[in-house]
C-alpha cells in the first residue's frame, strides 16, 4: 500500500487562452481504494478542480473512463482555458475512510501557464 505513487509526468504545461489543457496523472497501484481529486494550489486554500467521487465539473473531463475497473489513468482535460486558470495543479489520491476519505498521496504538481490567444 505504501508503494503507491501518484505520477504527474509534466512539470509544466503551456496552453493558449481558449484552448484545452491536458494535465496528466497516473497511479502505480489500485491500492488503497479511494478516489482521486485534482486541486489548484496546495495547503488549506487550495481550489478543488475535479473530484472523482462527487459532483459534475462542466469544464473538466477525464481523459480515460474512470468507471472502468482497474483504471489507473486520472488525467484530466480542462476546457476553454483563461489566464485565471494559471497555477500549479496537484493530482491527489485519497484513501477510503469513514466518515471521510483521507488524503493519502499527492503528485508533484504540474504548473499550467496560459499564453495570450494568437491574434
Amino acid at each position: 500500500e505504501e508503494g503507491l505513487q501518484v505520477i504527474q509526468p509534466d512539470k509544466s504545461v503551456s496552453v493558449a487562452a481558449g484552448e484545452s489543457a491536458i494535465l496528466h496523472c497516473t497511479a502505480t497501484s489500485l491500492i488503497p481504494v479511494g478516489p482521486i481529486q485534482w486541486f489548484r494550489g496546495a495547503g488549506p486554500g487550495r481550489e478543488l478542480i475535479y473530484n472523482q467521487k462527487e459532483g459534475h465539473f462542466p469544464r473538466v473531463t477525464t481523459v480515460s473512463d474512470l468507471t472502468k475497473r482497474n483504471n489507473m489513468d486520472f488525467s484530466i482535460r480542462i476546457g476553454n482555458i483563461t489566464p485565471a486558470d494559471a497555477g500549479t495543479y496537484y493530482c491527489v489520491k485519497f484513501r477510503k475512510g469513514s466518515p471521510d476519505d483521507v488524503e493519502f498521496k499527492s503528485g508533484a504538481g504540474t504548473e499550467l501557464s496560459v499564453r495570450a490567444k494568437p491574434s
Partner: antibody, heavy 120, light 107 residues
Framework: EVQLVESGGGVVQPGRSLRLSCAAS????????MIWVRQAPGKGLEWVAS????????YYADSVKGRFTISRDNSKNTLYLQMNSLRAEDTAVYYC?????????????WGQGTMVTVSS | AIQLTQSPSSLSASVGQRVTITCGAS??????MHWYQQKPGKAPKLLIY???NLEAGVPSRFSGSGSGTDFTLTISSLQPEDFATYYC?????????FGQGTKLEIK
C-alpha cells in the same frame, strides 16, 4: 446482500406533500451517490434527483425543481425525497438507486419502488 | 438536455435469435452510456455500463458497443428470460436521461 427499500408512497391530493424514504443495507451507504428515478404508469424511466455521497452535490430534473428536495442521513443509511406541491403528472412508481463514486457511474442497484398517486 | 432515441421502440423475436437495439444521443456522451433491462412490475437491472462493460452476474450473451452518439446493445442468442423492456441511459452530463425504451416480445 445489497438492499434498497422504498416507503412512503400512497394516494395524495394535488397540491399536497409526501415524503418518500429509501432504507439501504448491505453496503457502505456513505460511499455511494443516490438517485431517485420515477416511472409513470405505462411509460419510461425519468430521472428525478441525485445526491452525492456527502450531500455536497445535488441535482434535480427541471420537472421537479423547486418542488422536490432530495436528502440523506448517512448515520441512518436512509435517502429521502420530500415532494411538495404535487401534481397529477407526478403520479408514478418512484425508485431509489445507488451510484458508485462520481457523476459518470451507472445505477447498479435499485429498490423495488413505491407508488405515488396524485388524484383528487 | 441530451436526448436519447432508441430504435426500434418494439421488437418481436424468437428464442435463439440475435437481436440488436440502438440508442442515439443528440450530442456526444463519450462512453458514458449504460443499458438496463426491466421486466413488468420489477425494478430496472443494470446490464452494461460505460458502453461496453458487462455488469457482474450478467450473462455473456449481452454485449454493448459504441461511443460518442451511437450505441448498440446486442443479445447474441435470445433466451426466454430476455423478453423485457430495455433502456439506455447517459451519465455524461446532467440531467441524466433515459431512452424511451425498447420492448422485446416473443414472436
Amino acid at each position: 446482500e445489497v438492499q434498497l427499500v422504498e416507503s412512503g408512497g400512497g394516494v395524495v391530493q394535488p397540491g399536497r406533500s409526501l415524503r418518500l424514504s429509501c432504507a439501504a443495507s448491505g453496503f457502505t451507504f456513505s460511499d455511494y451517490g443516490m438517485i431517485w428515478v420515477r416511472q409513470a404508469p405505462g411509460k419510461g424511466l425519468e430521472w428525478v434527483a441525485s445526491i452525492s455521497s456527502s450531500s455536497s452535490y445535488i441535482y434535480y430534473a427541471d420537472s421537479v425543481k423547486g418542488r422536490f428536495t432530495i436528502s440523506r442521513d448517512n448515520s441512518k443509511n436512509t435517502l429521502y425525497l420530500q415532494m411538495n406541491s404535487l401534481r397529477a403528472e407526478d403520479t408514478a412508481v418512484y425508485y431509489c438507486a445507488r451510484r458508485y463514486y462520481g457523476f459518470n457511474y451507472p445505477f447498479d442497484y435499485w429498490g423495488q419502488g413505491t407508488m405515488v398517486t396524485v388524484s383528487s | 438536455a441530451i436526448q436519447l432515441t432508441q430504435s426500434p421502440s418494439s421488437l418481436s423475436a424468437s428464442v435463439g435469435q440475435r437481436v440488436t437495439i440502438t440508442c442515439g444521443a443528440s450530442k456526444s456522451v463519450r462512453t458514458y452510456m449504460h443499458w438496463y433491462q426491466q421486466k413488468p412490475g420489477k425494478a430496472p437491472k443494470l446490464l452494461i455500463y460505460s458502453a461496453s462493460n458487462l455488469e457482474a452476474g450478467v450473462p455473456s450473451r449481452f454485449s454493448g458497443s459504441g461511443s460518442g452518439t451511437d450505441f448498440t446493445l446486442t443479445i447474441s442468442s435470445l433466451q426466454p428470460e430476455d423478453f423485457a423492456t430495455y433502456y439506455c441511459q447517459q451519465s455524461n452530463e446532467p440531467p441524466y436521461t433515459f431512452g424511451q425504451g425498447t420492448k422485446l416480445e416473443i414472436k
